[in-house]
């Protein structure tokens, strides 16, 4: 994704389109450290009763133009004998997150702030049984 | 200084499978994508697919979907690249490089791996 | 599958010399391609990223240009280190794809 260009003077805060004219620094930086991220466990997705696939969702008109997204494998969840329990559902965990969406046609680039939902992971529930009146 | 360390040639009979490995130093593995290229002696490069080592997704170029498997071994910093039912026509050098997820581009190569299959 | 077309596939050329390559997209790639420089027997370095960034370390001789569909990429002044393959590449969509390449040779 490409940055917005700096403009060669700053912005006047007070001015009502001071939001339109704001350079965005797109380095990302991490604030916890180093380790954080090597701790970040990637086998859940195997172990977890719900289990879940990963997916590179892609759009080049997006920064970050890579996200990858939680899908749960299956509708019901595995029990302990590796069978699925029809009185268990899996479901899919979703966090709301911010993203730039590039303007199309604009020269140049400029971006939007939108909000997308992600899947991170998936979880197991207790099917809703209706009972019959 | 961010290295990416390849094993080393092979030669495989056709119908067999390969694994060739890439190990990673000098940065937080789990931290950027590895992606896996080849490129055959005399032609230009090939997309093979993407492993995050973070999470553990994978994604691949639909023509190794069914014989590519991309792995990632996190206490080890070392990225794998599976082929199996290799042909002729596999007979190739095969990178893994880092991909900067958020910058989008490669940066690192490993040395790459001489994969040579014949009967 | 984004085809990136370049050409010439080689060319001869003396140290001092300004060479130009060119690569097309089969469909607009918006700024995200890559350059890299390659010599027999070893991997792709990066040389330019993003069309016209050049990567940390790259002599200021490389540059690259373009924006959609068609991309340049030009060695200034050419030295006798520069002798190699050269390669474009788009990362806009996968599977990423790369040009067929073009061999720098001394004229």
């Known amino acids: 994704a490409a940055i917005i260009p700096q403009s060669s003077a700053c912005p006047n805060t007070e001015a009502k389109d001071f939001l339109q004219n704001v350079k965005v620094n797109l380095k990302v930086f991490n604030s916890l450290g180093a380790k954080v991220s090597s701790r970040r466990p990637s086998d859940y997705l195997n172990r977890s009763t719900s289990p879940w696939t990963l997916h590179r969702n892609e759009d080049p008109d997006r920064y970050p133009s890579v996200i990858w997204e939680a899908q749960c494998r299956h509708q019901r969840c595995v029990n302990a004998e590796g069978k699925l329990d029809h009185h268990m559902n899996s479901v899919l965990i979703q966090q709301e997150i911010l993203v730039l969406k590039r303007e199309p046609e604009s020269c140049p680039f400029t971006f939007r702030v939108e909000k997308m939902l992600v899947g991170v992971g998936c979880t197991c529930v207790a099917s809703i049984v209706r009972q019959a009146a | 200084e961010v290295q990416l360390v390849q094993s080393g040639a092979e030669v495989k009979k056709p119908g067999a499978s390969v694994k060739v490995s890439c190990k990673a130093s000098?940065?937080?593995?789990?931290?950027?994508?590895f992606h896996w290229v080849r490129q055959a002696p005399g032609q230009g490069l090939e997309w093979i697919g993407v492993?995050?080592?973070?999470?553990?997704?994978?994604a691949y170029n639909q023509n190794f979907r069914d014989r590519a498997t991309l792995t990632a071994d996190k206490s080890t910093s070392t990225a794998y690249m599976e082929l199996s039912s290799l042909r002729s026509e596999d007979t190739a050098v095969y990178y893994c490089?880092?991909?900067?997820?958020?910058?989008?581009?490669?940066?690192?190569w490993g040395q790459g791996t001489l994969v040579t299959v014949s009967s | 599958n984004i085809v990136m077309t370049q050409s010439p596939s080689s060319l001869s050329a003396s140290v001092g010399d300004r060479v130009t390559i060119t690569c097309k997209a089969s469909?607009?790639?918006?700024?995200?391609v890559g350059w890299f420089q390659q010599k027999p027997g070893k991997s792709p370095k990066l040389l330019i990223y993003?069309?016209?960034n050049r990567y940390t370390g790259v002599p200021s001789r490389f540059s690259g240009s373009g924006s959609g569909t068609d991309f340049t990429f030009t060695i200034s002044s050419l030295q006798p280190e520069d002798f190699a393959t050269y390669f474009c590449?788009?990362?806009?969509?996968?599977?990423?794809?790369f040009g067929q390449g073009t061999k720098l040779e001394i004229k």
């Open positions: 490089t880092r991909f900067l997820t958020y910058e989008g581009y490669f940066d690192y």
């Open positions: 000098g940065y937080t593995f789990t931290d950027y994508e």
């Open positions: 492993i995050h080592p973070g999470n553990g997704g994978t």
């Open positions: 469909q607009s790639v918006s700024i995200d």
């Open positions: 993003h069309a016209s």
């Open positions: 590449q788009q990362d806009y969509s996968s599977p990423y794809t």
